[in-house]
Interface confidence: medium
């Protein structure tokens, strides 16, 4: 029962995580205009992986896609790739894990096959989560670098009087969504891998013994009944299943580019 619960919970947690990774990838607020210590402008800039947007005070929002592939920074391309790989792996993992779920019967699929599929999907979720976390972290690092670079030359004197304020960008909501979603996918994957151990049929350390009675020939194999039903308790692994996944905290981001040249 604990195996089924762990597997089911791992599947649900991974599903939520992958949905979050997809959401983060599509979101426009990967970087948002830093409002601290800046003159108050009537426009708010923010950027995603695919387009940059400007929200004006009147409520009008204008977004422009990055219609170039070669002109974009290699780091941005790398982040895009990591997020897409994460989504693809996660989606395949979800597909595999559906068939691996213990509560779903498909033909005469053996527990060993389900165990293998559960392990495969678990590994896929782990890699998917790591891809998302890596992608978001690379972007965050890029932002931090650009932030301090633009702070260093924030005010460029022109004739002593004119000041050109450089727009600085800070972490957008998508980064926090991505980190949390990647973490959930990772946790879900670990849970699937744990569930796999419970699904695998227990191997015996001794061979079957034949007992010969007069006039009868009966072979008794220890554990045979347990393997044929789905109700055997796996005492060896029981202590593993003691709780569900939980995120440490929920991060809120303030709701408009490090310039892509």
């Amino acid at each position: 029962m604990a195996v089924t619960a762990c597997q089911g919970l791992g599947f649900v947690v991974s599903l939520i995580g992958i949905a979050g990774i997809i959401a983060a990838t599509c979101m426009d607020q990967w970087s948002t205009q830093d409002l601290y210590n800046n003159p108050v402008t009537a426009v708010f800039n923010y950027q995603g992986l695919w387009r940059s947007c400007v929200r004006e005070s009147s409520g009008f929002t204008e977004c422009r896609g990055y219609f170039t592939l070669l002109g974009l920074p290699a780091m941005l391309q790398a982040v895009r790739a990591l997020m897409i790989v994460g989504i693809v792996l996660g989606a395949i993992g979800l597909l595999v894990s559906i068939f691996a779920l213990k509560c779903i019967r498909i033909g005469s699929m053996e527990d060993s096959a389900k165990a293998n599929m559960t392990l495969t999907s678990g590994i896929m979720f782990i890699v998917s989560g790591l891809c998302a976390i890596a992608g978001v972290s690379v972007f965050a690092n890029m932002l931090v670098t650009n932030f301090w670079m633009s702070t260093a030359n924030m005010y460029t004197g022109m004739g002593g009087m004119v000041q050109t304020v450089q727009t600085r960008y800070t972490f957008g909501a998508a980064l926090f969504v991505g980190w949390v979603a990647g973490g959930l996918t990772l946790i879900g994957g670990v849970m699937m891998c744990i569930a796999c151990r419970g699904l695998a049929p227990e191997e015996t350390n001794y061979k079957a013994v034949s007992y010969h009675a007069s006039g009868h020939s009966v072979a008794y194999k220890p554990g045979g009944f347990k393997a044929s039903t789905g109700f055997g308790s796996n005492t060896k692994n029981k202590k593993i299943y003691d709780g569900g996944a939980r995120t440490e905290d929920e991060v809120q981001s303030y709701p408009s580019k490090h310039d892509y040249v």
Partner: antibody
């Protein structure tokens, strides 16, 4: 067609309060922002504040403590209230429509004269 | 607050002449997000409210004669009247449309000889 018309008291005693109403027609206050601008006699234009379509308000920081802007979308009216009036508040007060932000103030009222004396 | 400096404060020209007036901002009015300059030019004739001529530094408002041209980016902007007409007698104001408060320049008074 688009029209804006200001109406005010004309003459106000020092330290008193002022209330000017801008009645608009030809457009909706839920779609466009309205700005207030004043012009002292023989001087330049001074931006006072704006109330955006969504209801958010921005003021000239120098006058922020004395100003308030509100609107009644159903009556198509925008209100400018200003307290602790001094003689240097004597000016022509205009309301102007923001077509949408970044496109400038495309329609202006004829203005209402305020004399603080 | 952003300071908008207009020059010259006044100028007198003959009809048909080309006129150029300048507007300088104490901070850049160019938004990097959409590469748009948030600056507007207004014309105010005696006894009338201001009239919008140019927005976004260079886009002519509909109905404005094509002799009026706006140019510039960042902190330096120019309004050019290619061939001044008698009806162009007015004061011309530039306005910062980017930073709050939306400050106006002190104006350039155009007189016709």
């Amino acid at each position: 067609q688009v029209q804006l018309k200001e109406s005010g008291p004309g003459l106000v005693a020092p330290s008193q309060s002022l209330s000017i109403t801008c009645t608009v027609s030809g457009f909706s206050l839920t779609s466009h922002g309205v700005h207030w601008v004043r012009q002292p006699p023989g001087k330049g234009l001074e931006w006072l504040g704006v109330i955006w379509a969504g209801g958010s308000i921005n003021f000239n920081s120098a006058l922020m403590s004395r100003l308030s802007i509100s609107k009644d979308n159903s009556k198509n009216q925008v209100f400018l209230k200003m307290n602790s009036l001094q003689s240097d508040d004597t000016a022509m007060y205009y309301c102007a429509r923001d077509y949408y932000y970044g496109i400038g103030l495309d329609y202006w009222g004829q203005g209402t004269t305020l004399t603080v004396s | 607050d952003i300071v908008m400096t207009q020059s010259p404060s006044s100028l007198s020209v003959s009809a048909g002449e080309k006129v150029t007036m300048s507007c300088k901002s104490s901070q850049s009015l160019l938004n990097s997000g959409n590469q748009k300059n948030y600056l507007a030019w207004y014309q105010q004739k005696p006894g009338q409210p201001p009239k919008l001529l140019i927005y976004g530094a260079s886009t002519r408002e509909s109905g404005v004669p094509d002799r009026f041209t706006g140019s510039g980016s960042g902190t330096d902007f120019t309004l050019t009247i290619s061939s001044v007409q008698a009806e162009d007698l007015a004061v011309y104001y530039c306005q910062n449309d980017y930073y709050y408060p939306f400050t106006f320049g002190s104006g350039t008074k155009l007189e016709i000889k």
